[in-house]
Interface confidence: low
């Protein structure tokens, strides 16, 4: 006869490990007892359990409550045992010794491998601002046994670098994603993907990128200069910009206070029926936590009685 077992039994942390040991004998042969021991190199054998055909299962004190026989029905030639709730410390070499009648004793070894699935964490880098050089966007760390694989899934262009720290029974892998921040990256997902043989599927953690920026400011409303004449109603100037965080707007007049009746409504400056008093230089000031921009325009209200052309200047400054 001969023993059937596995070279390696792989189990995920916390699961039950079946340690197989089956005697395939000739007709009429019987198994008297099966002794299980842990036999790691450099250490003496440590008994796990003794499985006796007549007296049943006896578990050594060190493994009390953790070693059981597989559920019925049981084959009398099957000396397999279950090791409950596998922990990392269980990883190692195990031996089953089978005493048979009349063929004698047989022994076989297997290696128990305990997979420790990682619990990944993602840490965003410093605040991203347009104009920075290559900057850390996020780092992702996962520790497990064996070492997990950490990669990135994103449409954003960047560079990655990884490092690994080995511990006695596991390894921690950290991957960093560096990029050159630009406004087009705003709202883009950056996903850390962790693969490991102890995971049924890859673990994914997504970080949404936020890049601070402020676009140049410009003023709309003066495109048709002939509309800016005395008596016109509904005249308005609109300040155009965009930014992250969203900017706030402030209107001032460079050559004095805003005329009475002029309404400020966020990015829009609304005028009452135009008079020559509304002529002047108006400044839109756009700001967010990242930066500020100014754009100024010169309004020259035409008097239809006069046949003089109107000048309109647009100046943008940051």
């Amino acid at each position: 006869g001969e023993l059937e077992t596995s070279d390696v039994v792989t189990v995920v942390l916390g699961q039950d490990a079946k340690l197989p040991c089956f005697y395939r004998g000739d007709s009429g042969e019987q198994v008297g007892q099966v002794a299980w021991a842990r036999v790691d190199a450099g250490e003496g054998a440590q008994e796990l359990a003794l499985l006796h055909s007549k007296y049943g299962l006896h578990v050594s004190p060190a493994y009390e409550g953790r070693v059981e026989q597989p559920p019925p029905p049981r084959n009398p030639l099957d000396g397999s045992v279950l090791l409950r709730n596998a922990v990392q410390a269980d990883e190692g070499e195990y031996e089953c010794r089978v005493s048979t009648f009349p063929a004698g004793s047989f022994q076989a070894r297997l290696r128990l491998r305990v997979l420790v699935p990682p619990l990944p964490s993602l840490n965003p880098g410093p605040a991203l601002e347009e104009g920075q050089g290559l900057t850390l966007a996020a780092s992702c760390t996962a520790e497990g046994s064996p070492a997990p694989s950490v990669t990135w899934d994103t449409e954003v262009k960047g560079t990655t670098s990884s490092r690994s720290f080995k511990h006695s029974r596991s390894a921690a892998v950290t991957s960093e994603f560096h990029l050159v921040p630009s406004r087009s990256m705003n709202g883009q997902p950056l996903t850390c993907v962790v693969s490991h043989p102890g995971l049924l599927q890859d673990q994914r953690i997504t970080h949404i990128l936020h890049v601070s920026f402020l676009a140049e400011a410009s003023v709309r409303g003066l495109e048709d200069q002939n509309l800016w004449h005395i008596g016109r109603e509904g005249a308005m100037l609109k300040c155009l910009s965009e930014g992250q965080p969203p900017p706030s707007y402030n209107w001032t007049r460079l050559d004095g206070p805003l005329p009475s009746g002029v309404r400020v409504d966020g990015d829009t400056l609304g005028f009452p029926p135009l008079t020559t008093e509304h002529s002047g230089i108006y400044v839109c000031h756009v700001s967010n936590e990242f930066s500020s921009r100014d754009s100024q325009v010169t309004v020259d209200v035409l008097d239809p009685q006069e046949d003089s052309g109107k000048q309109v200047d647009l100046v943008s400054a940051s």
Partner: antibody
Framework: EVQLVESGGGLVQPGGSLRLSCAAS???????MSWVRQAPGKGLEWVSR???????DYADSVKGRFTISRDNSKNTLYLQMNSLRAEDTAVYYC???????????????WGQGTLVTVSS | DIQMTQSPSSLSASVGDRVTITCRAS??????LAWYQQKPGKAPKLLIY???SLQSGVPSRFSGSGSGTDFTLTISSLQPEDFATYYC?????????FGQGTKVEIK
């Protein structure tokens, strides 16, 4: 063990050019490489870095005047310095980013440095 | 750019003394900090990476600690060969920046 040897330093007039070389024994081209300089009696200042794909970063003080490059076949790193100024006077070191852990950009191997003097 | 400020700028100590050098970043840099030693006429030498990890071949009397903005390099028992200038460097974001240096002299 990696060894880095810089050359190409010397005396140059303001506005002039120099090309520094950094020859490596041992393979450096699966790593990032940097130039760091040190003005006489002063501290260390990072100048430029080149990545494995050939892309690069520069300090604001040298942007537009200096160009970093690498020749993988010769295992050599270069720094082309144009429009040199008196304040560029320094010992220039080439240095390798730590290879085995890729932890950010600390520098584990440095050359002995080459002196660049910009003076009329 | 992130500013790195070392203190003190110089110190005098005797062989066997415990020496502490601090480095402060103008913004949080996690553990992205390295310490270097430089002797006159020589290139800098990496002592500590990742704020607290000892570079291979560096004596265990050197240690680093800290995270965020405040970091410390400690020499537990100063030896004759430790008299040099020490620099911290952040590599959290580009450009990497160095502290101004701390010169350790013989008392």
């Amino acid at each position: 063990e990696v060894q880095l040897v810089e050359s190409g330093g010397g005396l140059v007039q303001p506005g002039g050019s120099l090309r520094l070389s950094c020859a490596a024994s041992g393979d450096i081209f699966d790593t990032y490489m940097s130039w760091v300089r040190q003005a006489p009696g002063k501290g260390l200042e990072w100048v430029s870095r080149i990545y494995t794909d050939g892309s690069s970063d520069y300090a604001d003080s040298v942007k537009g005047r200096f160009t970093i490059s690498r020749d993988n076949s010769k295992n050599t790193l270069y720094l082309q310095m144009n429009s040199l100024r008196a304040e560029d006077t320094a010992v220039y070191y080439c240095a390798r980013q730590t290879e085995d852990r890729s932890y950010g950009y600390d520098l584990d191997y440095w050359g002995q440095g080459t002196l660049v003097t910009v003076s009329s | 750019d992130i500013q790195m400020t070392q203190s003190p700028s110089s110190l005098s100590a005797s062989v066997g003394d415990r020496v502490t050098i601090t480095c402060r970043a103008s913004q949080g840099i996690s553990s992205y900090l390295a310490w270097y030693q430089q002797k006159p006429g020589k290139a800098p030498k990496l002592l500590i990476y990742a704020a607290s990890s000892l570079q291979s071949g560096v004596p265990s009397r050197f240690s680093g600690s800290g995270s965020g903005t405040d970091f410390t390099l400690t020499i537990s028992s100063l030896q004759p060969e430790d008299f040099a200038t020490y620099y911290c460097q952040q590599h959290y974001t580009t450009p990497p920046t160095f502290g101004q240096g701390t010169k350790v002299e013989i008392k």
